[in-house]
Structure formats: structure tokens, C-alpha cells
């Protein structure tokens, strides 16, 4: 289809680079959630940061190309890196508007599908992108 | 300041192919924007052809698809318009054009290209 | 394609009076609110020039003569007050939709 992507876009403070220029914020009227309609792909991404007691939000935004994970409808996130013992970052990627704005659902911490603790270590920032 | 310049041959016979240049200063083709192809035949009507943005992804007008192809050279900041297959109707004046978002704040000058026998 | 029909074809305006150009699209350039439709300046023997983008928003050092306004359809760029190197060919361009299209033009002149 021509009309292009719309997705949640969000950058935790600290974290290291911009997926901005990837698309045009909009004016949706409300500070939050922030809206931004993707230039180079029809696909939204998201960033989760699992630890033993919550899920915190990271990133969220446009991809800059259509990838395999793309055609998908929800957001279901997969282990991607361990930014720090204890914290799992997980990332989804989906192709329909607004479709990153959350999760479906995430596994609990240490269950199987998440890397073990012998798993990518990365300094705080660059793990973001090596998720991405 | 960023700017851009065309350059490439004036004159392509019909069923050849039609090769130009943009040439960008003041600015790295890698860091940002997409880098546009835009022509305005005689007449004045405008018609976007395609981008290659800094990543290095293509999209082209569909009405071209198959004839299109933008390339770019990051050594020398500079990215390609070849238009295979021309005609007397690809006879146009072909501008390169810089976008950060999907408007065009930064063209070239333009170059004439007639396809001609 | 999004066909933008732009009227009138040419208009000749008195210096100091008020200049109105409208382009309308065949199907809507918003997206959730956000109108996707800009506007260029064109003189003899140049490129377009960016004036106003995403239907109202001026370009930096455009002056505040240019004016733009609409959504979803129906937008319009204002010249008030229209001066001598106002006379040019303006061109609306939408982006809500692939591929991006261009009006076919307004050209302004002086009375």
C-alpha cells in the first residue's frame, strides 16, 4: 500500500543515537504518547528492558527498512542483549499504525527463549543498538 | 549550506539510456536525507522519479520502476540517475533534490536532457 | 497516484493586494491530523523553491507575506501583500501518499 507507517516514537533518557530522522513527528495534540510517520519503511520497532521486577520502555520508532519481523501484526518481543546482569532487552518489530505502542506479551526473566547470563554483554547505550 | 549540482550529457537518442550525476557539498550523503530525483518536462509539470536515501535504500515512482535505477558513489558524495529505454517523452529538465522529511528544501540547479535522434 | 488540481491557472494581482492559489487532492493528504501537503516558488530559469511545508509551517527566511492553510483536501497559499518579485510559478506538492506528486501550477502575474 502508498500510505506510509505510523508508529510510537520514544527515546529513554541516556540512551545513546536517534531513530528521529527515520521519519516526521506529528502533532497529535497530546504530549504522550508522541507519533511518528516513518520515510524509509512501513515497519515500527520496540525496545523493552526486562529485569527481575519490571519492563521499562527504551526506544520505540520507525525502522529504517522492511525486514523479516515486519509483516507482523502485534508486537512480540524477542531476547535480543544483556545491557547488565539481571536486564534482558527485548525487541519487536510489527507493520501495522501504532502497533509498537506495547507488548503482547514477554517472558518472565531466565525462562527458555532468554539468553542465559552467559549471553552479549554491552555497555550501557550500545546494547540499544545492538538490539536494534 | 548544502548544495547540489547535476551535470551529465545533454543530448541521448531515443532507446538509449540517460545517465546524470548529482554532485553534494556541505554535506554527507551518508549522515542523512534522501537524495531525490525530480524532473519537470516542457510544459512545467513536475514529477518525482525516485530517492536513495543515506542507508543506501532506493524507492522509485512506480511509473518508472522498471526503467529507474539510483545509485550512489559515498567516496565522492555524489548519487546517479540512470533511465533506461528513453524516448522523445523523457525529454526534460532533471533537477537532484535533498529531503530530510518527504518535502524538498534543497535542489540543484537542474539540467536539460532532450532525447533526440 | 494523489492528483493535485491547483486553480487558477494564472492570476494577475495588483502590487499591495492579496493573492490567493488553491490546490485541491483527489483523495485526503492528512495522516491522524497532519496535513502532508507544501508549496514552492518557481522563477524563470530556476529551481522550486520551498515556501511553506506541511500545509502552514513557513520555511526559514520566507518571508511572513506567505501564508498557508487547509487540511485533508482543500489547502490554500496566500500572498498578502503580493510585491514585484512575488511573480513566479507556484507549485503544491503532497507527501501523504507514494509517489509524491506536484500540482501543475499557478502562475502569478502583476496587474
Known amino acids: 500500500p502508498p500510505n506510509r507507517r505510523t508508529c510510537v516514537f520514544f527515546e529513554a533518557p541516556g540512551v545513546r543515537g536517534s531513530t528521529k530522522t527515520l521519519g516526521e513527528l506529528l502533532d497529535t495534540g497530546t504530549e504522550l504518547p508522541r507519533a511518528i510517520r516513518c520515510l524509509y519503511s512501513r515497519c515500527c520497532f520496540g525496545i523493552w528492558n526486562l529485569t527481575q521486577d519490571r519492563a521499562q520502555v527504551e526506544m520505540q520508532g520507525c525502522r529504517d527498512s522492511d525486514e523479516p519481523g515486519c509483516e507482523s501484526l502485534h508486537c512480540d518481543p524477542s531476547p535480543r542483549a544483556h545491557p547488565s546482569p539481571g536486564s534482558t532487552l527485548f525487541t519487536c518489530s510489527c507493520g501495522t499504525d501504532f502497533c509498537n505502542a506495547n507488548y503482547s506479551h514477554l517472558p518472565p526473566p531466565g525462562s527458555p527463549g532468554t539468553p542465559g547470563s552467559q549471553g552479549p554483554q554491552a555497555a550501557p547505550g550500545e546494547s540499544i543498538w545492538m538490539a536494534l | 549550506d548544502v548544495q547540489l549540482q547535476e551535470s551529465g550529457p545533454g543530448l541521448v537518442k531515443p532507446s538509449q539510456s540517460l545517465s546524470l550525476t548529482c554532485t553534494v557539498t556541505?554535506?554527507?550523503?551518508?549522515?542523512?536525507?534522501?537524495w531525490n530525483w525530480i524532473r519537470q518536462f516542457p510544459g512545467n509539470k513536475l514529477e518525482w522519479m525516485g530517492y536513495?536515501?543515506?542507508?543506501?535504500?532506493?524507492s522509485y515512482n512506480p511509473s518508472l520502476k522498471s526503467r529507474i535505477s539510483i545509485t550512489r558513489d559515498t567516496s565522492k558524495n555524489q548519487f546517479f540517475l540512470q533511465l533506461n529505454s528513453v524516448t522523445t517523452e523523457d525529454t526534460a529538465t532533471y533537477y537532484c533534490a535533498g529531503s530530510r522529511y518527504s518535502w524538498f528544501a534543497y535542489w540543484g540547479q537542474g539540467t536539460l536532457v532532450t532525447v533526440s535522434a | 497516484d494523489i492528483v493535485l488540481t491547483q486553480s487558477p491557472a494564472s492570476l494577475a494581482v495588483s502590487l499591495g493586494q492579496r493573492a490567493t492559489i488553491s490546490c485541491r487532492a483527489s483523495?485526503?493528504?492528512?495522516?491522524?491530523?497532519?496535513?502532508?501537503m507544501h508549496w514552492y516558488q518557481q522563477k524563470p530559469g530556476q529551481p522550486p523553491k520551498l515556501l511553506i511545508y506541511?500545509?502552514?509551517n513557513l520555511e526559514s527566511g520566507i518571508p511572513a507575506r506567505f501564508s498557508g492553510s487547509g487540511s485533508r483536501t482543500d489547502f490554500t497559499l496566500t500572498i498578502n501583500p503580493v510585491e514585484a518579485d512575488d511573480v513566479a510559478t507556484y507549485y503544491c506538492?503532497?507527501?501523504?501518499?507514494?509517489?509524491?506528486?506536484f500540482g501543475g501550477g499557478t502562475k502569478l502575474e502583476i496587474k
Open positions: 506538492q503532497q507527501s501523504n501518499e507514494d509517489p509524491y506528486t
Open positions: 556541505g554535506y554527507s550523503i551518508t549522515s542523512d536525507f534522501a
Open positions: 506541511r500545509a502552514s
Open positions: 483523495e485526503s493528504v492528512d495522516t491522524y491530523g497532519n496535513s502532508f
Open positions: 536513495i536515501n543515506f542507508s543506501g535504500s532506493t
